[in-house]
Amino acid sequence: SIPWNLERIIPAWHQTEEDRSPDGSSQVEVYLLDTSIQGAHREIEGRVTITDFNSVPEEDGTRFHRQASKCDSHGTHLAGVVSGRDAGVAKGTSLHSLRVLNCQGKGTVSGTLIGLEFIRKSQLIQPSGPLVVLLPLAGGYSRILNAACRHLARTGVVLVAAAGNFRDDACLYSPASAPEVITVGATNAQDQPVTLGTLGTNFGRCVDLFAPGKDIIGASSDCSTCFMSQSGTSQAAAHVAGIVARMLSREPTLTLAELRQRLIHFSTKDVINMAWFPEDQQVLTPNLVATLPPSTHETGGQLLCRTVWSAHSGPTRTATATARCAPEEELLSCSSFSRSGRRRGDWIEAIGGQQVCKALNAFGGEGVYAVARCCLVPRANCSIHNTPAARAGLETHVHCHQKDHVLTGCSFHWEVEDLSVRRQPALRSRRQPGQCVGHQAASVYASCCHAPGLECKIKEHGISGPSEQVTVACEAGWTLTGCNVLPGASLTLGAYSVDNLCVARVHDTARADRTSGEATVAAAICCRSRPSAKASWVQ
Amino acid sequence: QDEDGDYEELMLALPSQEDGLADEAAHVATATFRRCSKEAWRLPGTYIVVLMEETQRLQIEQTAHRLQTRAARRGYVIKVLHIFYDLFPGFLVKMSSDLLGLALKLPHVEYIEEDSFVFAQ
């Protein structure tokens, strides 16, 4: 007798666990920026503080009739999903509501900004435990709303936002497109993307993960013990806000980067049917459904990584794409991907003291993506070693020459535009362990890291026959940090990481033309962190 | 994630002589004007003036006051609805779009964003 959504996100071993910190009271506070709410509802009574904050536009229409229960509907339901006594994810959590949406569910960017500033002021006046801000709203892309989210996130606040219900790229909406926000798409009881009339959940690279968002039972503002079902990415975001609140309740010192990495790592993978999304968005959209992760004490010092895609570079000849990790994360590798296969590779460079992953379009190309592998590596010291392109016919080798540094990723960037003359780069795991090897006209970049107990190895998988893609996975206990495509077909689309799987994509025409001798190889660098061990390269 | 996707950015670097004031003539607008790509979601007449990251508290107030003063010289009344101090330096203003060029040339201004709607999801 438990609603499907709670069953889905809270694994069996967590069901009876109390959502409390050791002293018996949760110190986590969730701020909800939404409509007004019915604080007397049994689900949330005693846990919710209705602040005096109110910044909403006038309702449209002269005949609009304000009915309290309708005005409170959206916010009350979400408050219930976060911390409701019976249908809530984080049942013990205290919640503060700020009214930024009117009775028609409309607000403004300026009202939302003033709301976020109100939270910051509250934080300054009376510092408390961990804060989670739930933003179950979306508007068009707003530079200032995203910037405000960034500033608030840098003060230690965790922001969770709805991806949007427009069946569109979430990057076109705010606050969904803010990188510092945990952006949540919606799935149904069958773990499929939510359809809402002719629209549905947003998708794309700006979505961090999905969560239940269809027919969610929660508090209804119609009466103090009423329930109703609502659907949308707001409901999905509320689930993740609840999960985050529970994680912080157990471990109040978890940072945004750790929370996001753990949410991704422990989510249910590959259950969403990606065919629902537009073809060009499928590779960019995470196939992840949120579940409550175990505590860090139960899971040890795992190496956690996530894949961050850049925006599309655009088709111009010198167009570049840039993918960035969060400030706390290490950029362990950089790869690139182009649907046309016309790309000039990828490299890592420092911009404003931060390493970024860059990819370059080639002449005649439709554009590229840079694909960063962003990892949490405690006490890491990482550096990039690069070697300029060698003369024709020669190989370029780069390895990690500092003591105790291991290779976590390779990047290759071709100087020449003519794709027919160049050979693909290679990682040679057997002959030359721990080296990146480039071929004609390629500059080679090696990402080298030192961290206590970090050890890495290369794993390759080649296919000679026709195949659209070649994959290689890191085995259990190892984490994929680098992914490249090795010599084979003259034209590859590039390589990228999907969870612990390295995917090398091959152009259709290349598949048809390829002789059986030209194997396309996916090469993965797999690492693990064993705090007691020394940094090492595993052959 | 945060590249400016489907977003309107308009350069309104209008001739600086337009005001005929010495301190303004020296300041050519490098600030940009931004607004929502979806026309129906725009709220023309309300603008968020975003100042440079390091702008001090007093400078925020001075910039808002300066805009009011210069607008008044042209016969426009503008209303400063809110001043942002804690998350970013800036202010929210209700004014005619005719004054955008003037506002963009104010010192410390990084960009101006037209207010727009957000919706429950």
């Epitope: 007798s1 438990i2 609603p3 007397a40 049994r42 229960s69 006594r85 019976d86 249908a87 049942k91 039972i217 119609d222 009466c223 103090s224 013990t225 009423c226 329930f227 | -």
Partner: antibody, heavy 126, light 106 residues
């Protein structure tokens, strides 16, 4: 079928704490589908809801009595209890315990009170 | 607090007659109103919930109607066992009960 039975002292002195227990039989108290409630009825008067609790111990009280009421649950004994502090003669009543469907699981039935215990009279007098 | 006022306080009727009981709320309770029957020395029993739905095992002679602030419980033809006190209760905001209507034999 499910039955509820109230127990506790029939006489309590003014300013003391009234304590009652409700024992549930024929079903488990540990279900997310239900709340367990206390309702009272002063002699010859109407009914007044006191408060409710779920199996996790999450409580919900009548605002007018909140400062004096504590409801607790013991799932191992399939019981829930009422404590009402600082009693006066106005607290003299028949005290009923009842089950209420929480509404979270619509299939569990209507979101109202029932079944009820048969009630126990508590008199506040010195 | 939502106050429920029941009228009349006492209704004197003969078996076979039609009984009409009224319950008025101080503010709208939508359709979140129930009717209970209480016989002397017994606990109340749920008759009607959500204004017009009969609870399990309740005879068809009992019916409820109304919404917002005005509600009616109708017993189409009184049986001897129907003589009792009837209470209305709302759950729009917390839980409150009406003062009761006693249906007695004329």
């Amino acid at each position: 079928q499910l039955q509820l039975q109230e127990s506790g002292p029939g006489l309590v002195k003014p300013s003391e704490t009234l304590s009652l227990t409700c024992t549930v039989s024929g079903g488990s108290i540990s279900s997310a589908s239900y709340y367990w409630s206390w309702i009272r009825q002063p002699p010859g008067k109407g009914l007044e809801w006191i408060g409710s609790i779920n199996y996790r111990g999450s409580t919900y009280y009548n605002p007018s009595l909140k400062s004096r009421v504590t409801i607790s649950v013991d799932t191992s004994k399939n019981q829930f209890s009422l404590k009402l502090s600082s009693v006066t003669a106005a607290d003299t009543a028949v005290y009923y315990c009842a089950r209420e469907n929480s509404g979270v699981v619509p299939a569990a039935g209507p979101n109202w009170f029932g079944p009820w215990g048969q009630g126990t009279l508590v008199t506040v007098s010195s | 607090e939502i106050v429920l006022t029941q009228s009349p306080a006492t209704l004197s009727l003969s078996p076979g007659e039609r009984a009409t009981l009224s319950c008025r709320a101080s503010q709208s309770v939508s359709s979140y109103l129930a009717w209970y029957q209480q016989k002397p020395g017994q606990a109340p029993r749920l008759l009607i919930y959500d204004a017009s739905n009969r609870a399990t095992g309740i005879p068809a002679r009992f019916s409820g109607s109304g919404s917002g602030t005005d509600f009616t419980l109708t017993i189409s033809s009184l049986e001897p066992e129907d003589f009792a006190v009837y209470y209305c209760q709302q759950r729009r905001n917390w839980f409150t009960f009406g003062g009761g209507t006693k249906v007695e034999i004329k």
